[in-house]
Each structure stands twice: as C-alpha cells, then as structure tokens.
C-alpha cells in the first residue's frame, strides 16, 4: 500500500503527520519494549476525547471504539512486542484531521505521545482558454484542494492581482476558479496554484502565437513544444491539439506519454516530427480549406504543470480559386 | 520513588458524605488509571472504582454504583473519592491504588489508607 | 460477578518449609491474576501479574502458575520475613479478591 504522509518532528512528543483525502495513513508511535502492555490511540478536540483504538490484554479492544474510526483503524500487532504502536488509518476524511494521543503502558512504564493529523488535498487543476462573444478568458480551475490554496497570475513574468476569483466548499474541500480577462492580449500568462499543505505547486502557462496566414489547399505546421524547465524527465503527461470554434473545443488528436500512443481524430492531421524524444509536439494540417480558419490549441499537461499554446491560422483563398470568381 | 498518601478519613454519620484525597507523588500521574480499594479491620479487600488515564472512563463496585465518585485532578496529581449516602456497611480503610497502566490490569503499588467510620 | 474462593483460609509452617496456596475462580478469567502479600499495618505489596509472573524485585522464591479456574502461590523455601496475609487478584471482569491466607509461624 502506498502511503502518503509527510513527517515533521516537534518538540514535546509532538509530531506532525500530513495525509491525503481518501488515502491511508499510518500515525507513528513507539516505545520501549515491555511486557503486559496497554495502547489506546484517542482523538481529541477542544471538547471531548474519542477512543480511536484500544489494545490491552492480548487483543485488540474495540467496544468503546468512537462509531467514526469503525473499520477504519488498526494495529500492526505482530510488532507491538518490538515497540511498534502505531495505527493505521484507512480512508482519511478532513474531519479526521486533530490531534491523537498515543497512550502506552507496559509493566515498567506508561508514556503519551502526541500527533498532530492535517489533511490535504489537491486535484490536479486544470487552465482553459475560452472564448465568450469577443471575449478572452484563461481560467485556472482546481476541482478540490484543501486547505485554502495560494493563487497567483503572472503576466511576461510579472505578477498581477486582476482575476475574478469563484470559490465553492465552505468548510472544505474546495472548488476553486480563477479567471482573468485576457481579450486583445498577445503577451504569454502564467497561473500557480500551490497547496502549501502538501507542499505541491501546480503551474499552467499560455502562449499565444503569431498568427499564421496560409493559402487553400497549402499546409501548416503548428509548433508546441515540451519547455525542460516544466517537465522532468520520467513524468507522466498527456498532449491534446484541439480547435476552438464559436467557443466550443473539437478534439483533433490525443497523445499519451506513458503508452506513447497518439490518437487523431482528424485525417488531415499528423505529426510534425517522429516522436522520438518527446519533446515537440509540432502538427501538419495539410489541404487547408478557409474554413479551417480559427485558434488551434495545443495542451501539455502533467500532475505539475499545463503549457497551453495557442495559434490563430488565417486560410485564404488561393489565387485560382480567386480568379475563377 | 512512588508514593499514594490518602487523607480525609474520618468518622461520620449515616446518610452524610465525606470526600477523600489521595495525593501522588514520584511519577507520572496523568499516565496511569487510579483505582480506591476498601478493606475492613481484620477482613479481605474490596475493590470500590476505577478511574481511567485520562479521566475519561470510570468504573465502580455495584455496592457503591450513585453513591460514590471517582474524579482526579492530574494538574494537582490527586485522585479523589466522593462519597454520599454513606451506610455502616462502608466503614473500611480506603486506600488509593495505582494500576500498572489503563486497561483493566494489576494493582502495582497502594497507598497506606486512610479509615472512613460511618456510625451514629 | 467472578467469585475468588482462596485456600487454606491459616496456613501454619517454618521457615525453610516449601508453601502452596490456593485461589479457584468461579469461571475462567484466563491468566488474569496477581498475587499480594501484606502484612499488619503496611499496604499490600505486588509479587505476581498474569498468574505467573514475577514482579521485578521480588524474591524468586516465589512462583505462580496456573490458568482458566486453578491458580497457585508457592514460596520455596519460607524466609521469616515471608509470614504475612497474600491475596489474590482477579482482573479479567472488573476486580476481584480473594479472601485471604494468613501465613503463621508453626
């Protein structure tokens, strides 16, 4: 079982575990071996204790088990004999976050130790280009964090405050979208949301293309690349070319890094390169027609980081197909 | 070294309460479950409440069950027995027991007991 | 309730003599047990835990054994400061004590 928890260690028996919503966790407690020994793990909040688990006389001890930790907390009890007192808990809940005490008693000694549960969580966030009537908008969206995030926009590196911010989730987990108006703009913005919890930063950058004017029946080539600074090596992403039109985004091709497989969904469509290396995603979108005319996005998205790039394609009608008008 | 003094002993009459002390000393009070055996003169012993590490479970002896109270105050490392409605029948010495730790284990070490005579 | 009937009630013996003491459980409270000695006037002090078990400063004269109903106390070989009242203990539902054996000098 994998299991994600970061540990702080504080004065005082004190120590700080941080889980994730919905994983599994394990609350450490040790203590010098000895026998005839006693735990109980309790919860405790500014008004009340609640038994977490027991363990005394041989066995676990669950008659007086609070009914919120039911199926959800254990022992390792081939090792309590070794000094292992800690408890696993399963499926954490925000409400699961405050302090548990440890208390351990054997025939020679009886100790208390103190951890400190916090809870976070981060949905990896999503950047979205959208157009409303004339309109331009980026907007970063993450579906669930918890705690309260720290969102900020820069605009060619340098931070700026105007975004219309929409939050949902009174006490957590929160939904959250960040929206900034972006119409007439050609400079590049970048998004950051980090969850100072959890310690994880999520990026999304969007750049915007000279506009491409070609004739019918040409091609084009449509550049994206993999930027080094945002993706290491062995991370997982996916990239989708999509075209924008009245607003409404169509698919034209997907591509997946960890099967390395490329789906299109546009006949026309293809890579620029073989995708040897991985890092440029450039396409060809050959016999253009003017009504391929639009904004063409294509999206590098990892856990950490979203790079979308956009570009504008102009088709114009060919020389003969003006004459013969 | 481990010591339990009790205090607040004494003679009363039927029917009248009386609280007794225990005050701890030479380790970690907050840590263990307390415990108030009783023994008559010359008789066997009778185990009469439990009080839990943290103060959040007690226990009594059905002789005694809303008559008697267990509480302890750990800022002041004592442990403390309420008792009302008191009969000629809980005339004992009552000592102060600690248990090895908290969970329904042995009695490591007791105080000398204090002696509650109920009488008219 | 657990009863704990506990025999004999006055053992008489000398020093040097081997001793067995007794205590039956009215239904089966596993190794839940400990053993007490006191003497007049002094508080009870732990010699035995889980039936068998020897309290850590205890004289290894003195034994334990037993489980489920049947439990006894040895003491080897009797010491002068080993005449005293021993009780038992059980704490396998809630706690109770035996009677008492009052070890006399013969």
């Known amino acids: 079982i994998f299991l994600s928890a970061f540990f702080t260690y504080v004065p005082m028996n004190e120590q700080i575990i941080i889980g994730r919503l919905g994983e599994d966790i394990i609350l450490p407690s040790s203590f010098e071996r000895g026998s005839e020994v006693v735990i109980h793990w309790k919860y405790q909040d500014s008004y009340n204790s609640y038994n977490v688990h027991s363990y005394y006389k041989g066995s676990g001890r669950l008659e007086s088990q609070d009914t919120r930790y039911a199926n959800r907390t254990s022992l390792f009890y081939n090792e309590i004999q070794n000094g292992n007192a800690s408890l696993f808990f399963r499926r954490l809940s925000l409400l699961d976050e405050g302090i548990y005490t440890c208390y351990v008693g054997t025939a020679i000694q009886a100790i208390t130790n103190k951890v400190v549960l916090k809870v976070g969580v981060f949905l990896t966030p999503m950047m979205k280009y959208e157009k409303r009537n004339t309109n331009s908008f980026l907007i970063c969206n993450v579906l669930s964090v918890y705690p309260r995030p720290i969102i900020t926009w820069k605009m060619d590196n340098t931070p700026i405050s105007e975004n219309n911010m929409q939050e949902t989730g009174s006490l957590g987990p929160f939904s959250i979208n960040s929206t900034l108006n972006i119409t007439g703009s050609n400079s590049s913005y970048e998004c950051t949301i980090e969850n100072s919890l959890l310690k994880q930063t999520w990026t999304g950058r969007w750049t915007m293309k000279d506009g491409l004017h070609k004739m019918q029946s040409e091609h084009v080539s449509l550049s994206c690349e993999l930027v080094n600074d945002y993706f290491s090596p062995n991370q997982d992403f996916k990239v989708t070319w999509s075209r924008m039109e009245s607003g409404i985004s169509s698919i034209l091709a997907y591509y997946l890094s960890s099967s390395q497989n490329t789906t299109f969904y546009e006949s026309r469509f293809s890579w620029n390169k073989e995708l040897k290396n991985q890092s440029d995603f450039s396409m060809n979108l050959t016999d253009l027609s003017l009504s391929d005319s639009g904004e063409y996005l294509c999206n590098i998205s990892s856990d950490e980081y979203t790079l979308l790039t956009i570009h504008t394609v102009h088709v114009e009608p060919s020389q003969e197909t003006a004459s013969d008008n | 070294q481990v010591q339990l003094v009790e205090s607040g002993g004494g003679v009363v009459q039927p029917g009248r309460s009386l609280r007794l002390s225990c005050a701890a000393s030479?380790?970690?009070?907050?840590?263990?479950?307390m415990h108030w055996v009783r023994q008559v003169p010359g008789k066997g012993l009778e185990w009469v409440a439990l009080i839990w590490y943290d103060g959040s479970e007690k226990y009594y002896a059905d002789s005694v069950k809303g008559r008697f109270t267990i509480s302890r105050d750990d800022s002041k490392n004592t442990l403390f027995l309420q008792m009302s409605s008191l009969r000629a029948e809980d005339t004992a010495v009552y000592s102060c027991?600690?248990?090895?730790?908290?969970?329904?284990?042995?009695?490591?070490?007791w105080g000398q007991g204090t002696q509650v005579t109920v009488s008219s | 309730d657990i009863q704990m009937t506990q025999s004999p009630s006055t053992l008489s013996a000398s020093v040097g003599d081997r001793v067995t003491i007794t205590c039956r459980a009215s239904q089966s409270i596993s190794s839940w047990l400990a053993w007490y000695q006191q003497k007049p006037g002094k508080a009870p002090k732990l010699l035995i835990y889980k039936a068998s078990s020897l309290k850590s400063g205890v004289p290894s004269r003195f034994s334990g054994s037993g489980s489920g109903t049947e439990f006894t106390l040895t003491i080897s070989s009797l010491q002068p400061d080993d005449f005293a009242t021993y009780y038992c203990l059980q704490y396998n539902s809630y706690y109770t004590f035996g009677q008492g054996t009052k070890l006399e000098i013969k």
């Open positions: 030479g380790f970690t009070f907050s840590n263990y479950a």
């Open positions: 027991v600690r248990e090895y730790s908290s969970g329904w284990g042995y009695f490591d070490y």
